[in-house]
């Protein structure tokens, strides 16, 4: 019962997380104009991964897509890639986990197969969550770098007379959505991996039973028979689980400092 609950909760949490990752990726407010300590402008600038927008005081909002691939900063491309990989992995993970759910019966699928699928989806959710968190963090780092760069030369004087105000950008709502969604997907994945352990059929440790035949005392241990047949699948599951743990550790960590053009 607890296993089913853990698996179900893991699925729901991951589903919410992936929906959040998709939402964050599509959102326009990855970076928003910093209004603090700036002249009050009659326009509000904000940017997403796919387009930049300007909302005027008049009520009009104009958005322009980035209709170039080569002209975009490498970091933006990297963030896009991370988010898309996260979405794809998450979507596959969701598909796999639907069939892995204990409450759903598909033909004569064994518990061991469901355990494997649960683990696979769990790992996919973990990697998906890490991709989203990494993508959002790379973008956030890029913003912080740019913010301090533009603060350093915020007012560029022209002959000491005319001033040009540089628009500074700060964290947009999409970053927080992305972080939370990535975290939820990660948590959901961990829950699926935990549920996998409970789903795998455990070795039945029967106590030795003595059968008293007339004049003879024979001890019968069925464990030996079980080991000699192909039913001892728990060992195999353990192997996959360990491999899964290794895969989690192999997820690349990204450098914290990036150049943004």
């Amino acid at each position: 019962m607890a296993v089913t609950a853990c698996q179900g909760l893991g699925f729901v949490v991951s589903l919410i997380g992936i929906a959040g990752i998709i939402a964050a990726t599509c959102m326009d407010q990855w970076s928003t104009q910093d209004l603090y300590n700036n002249p009050v402008t009659a326009v509000f600038n904000y940017q997403g991964l796919w387009r930049s927008c300007v909302r005027e005081s008049s009520g009009f909002t104009e958005c322009r897509g980035y209709f170039t691939l080569l002209g975009l900063p490498a970091m933006l491309q990297a963030v896009r890639a991370l988010m898309i990989v996260g979405i794809v992995l998450g979507a596959i993970g969701l598909l796999v986990s639907i069939f892995a759910l204990k409450c759903i019966r598909i033909g004569s699928m064994e518990d061991s197969a469901k355990a494997n699928m649960t683990l696979t989806s769990g790992i996919m959710f973990i990697v998906s969550g890490l991709c989203a968190i990494a993508g959002v963090s790379v973008f956030a780092n890029m913003l912080v770098t740019n913010f301090w760069m533009s603060t350093a030369n915020m007012y560029t004087g022209m002959g000491g007379m005319v001033q040009t105000v540089q628009t500074r950008y700060t964290f947009g709502a999409a970053l927080f959505v992305g972080w939370v969604a990535g975290g939820l997907t990660l948590i959901g994945g961990v829950m699926m991996c935990i549920a996998c352990r409970g789903l795998a059929p455990e070795e039945t440790n029967y106590k030795a039973v003595s059968y008293h035949a007339s004049g003879h005392s024979v001890a019968y241990k069925p464990g030996g028979f079980k080991a000699s047949t192909g039913f001892g699948s728990n060992t195999k599951n353990k192997k996959i689980y360990d491999g899964g743990a290794r895969t989690e550790d192999e997820v690349q960590s990204y450098p914290s400092k990036h150049d943004y053009v």
């Epitope: 402008t41 009659a42 326009v43 600038n45 930049s52 300007v54 005027e56 009520g59």
Partner: antibody, heavy 118, light 113 residues
Framework: EVKLVESGGGLVQPGGSLKLSCAAS????????MAWVRQAPGKGPEWVAF????????YYADTVTGRFTISRENAKNTLYLEMSSLRSEDTAMYYC???????????WGQGTLVTVSA | DIVMTQSPSSLTVTAGEKVTMSCKSS????????????LTWYQQKPGQPPKLLIY???TRESGVPDRFTGSGSGTDFTLTISSVQAEDLAVYYC?????????FGAGTKLELK
């Protein structure tokens, strides 16, 4: 056809109060930012106050901050300007304007005259 | 506050003549978000409210004759009337539409010779 009609102007003593109204028609009022602009006799226009479509953002000129209050009633398609502690320098023709592209004052009313005199 | 400086304060012209008037702002009116200059030109005739001519420094409002052309970027802007007509005699104002307060220039008065 966009139509803006101001009302509520008149003669008022210094220190007095007045409430101007602007009835809008011919467009979806709740979708546009609105403003009040005044013009003293023989002078150029002077922006007074701005209110966003949802009344979330409100800005005033330094000369009227704390004395004037801009508000809107989207259900009634009406813009207001409540003026208090009036001074002689507030004497002007007050125009109601609807913002357009580029935050420009795309449409103007015919104005209502406010005279502050003892 | 942004200071808008218009020059000349008045212009005496003859019909059919080409006219240019200048507007300078104390701060750049170029918005980096969309690379547009938030400067507007208005025309005001006696007894009438100002009429919008050009927004975004160079975009003509619908219904405005194409003899009116706006140009410039950053802090220096120009309004050009390619061939002045009698009905163009008015006061022309430029306005900063990027920073609050939304300041107007003092105006350029166009008069007939």
């Amino acid at each position: 056809e966009v139509k803006l009609v101001e009302s509520g102007g008149g003669l008022v003593q210094p220190g007095g109060s007045l409430k101007l109204s602007c009835a809008a028609s011919g467009f979806t009022f709740s979708r546009y930012g609105m403003a009040w602009v005044r013009q003293a006799p023989g002078k150029g226009p002077e922006w007074v106050a701005f209110i966003s479509n949802s009344a979330y953002s409100i800005y005033y000129a330094d000369t009227v901050t704390g004395r004037f209050t801009i508000s809107r009633e989207n259900a009634k398609n009406t813009l207001y300007l409540e003026m208090s502690s009036l001074r002689s320098e507030d004497t002007a023709m007050y125009y109601c304007a609807r913002l357009g592209y580029g935050n420009s004052f795309a449409y103007w009313g015919q104005g209502t005259l406010v005279t502050v005199s003892a | 506050d942004i200071v808008m400086t218009q020059s000349p304060s008045s212009l005496t012209v003859t019909a059919g003549e080409k006219v240019t008037m200048s507007c300078k702002s104390s701060q750049s009116l170029l918005n980096s978000g969309n690379q547009k200059n938030y400067l507007t030109w208005y025309q005001q005739k006696p007894g009438q409210p100002p009429k919008l001519l050009i927004y975004w420094a160079s975009t003509r409002e619908s219904g405005v004759p194409d003899r009116f052309t706006g140009s410039g970027s950053g802090t220096d802007f120009t309004l050009t009337i390619s061939s002045v007509q009698a009905e163009d005699l008015a006061v022309y104002y430029c306005q900063n539409e990027l920073f609050y307060p939304l300041t107007f220039g003092a105006g350029t008065k166009l008069e007939l010779k």
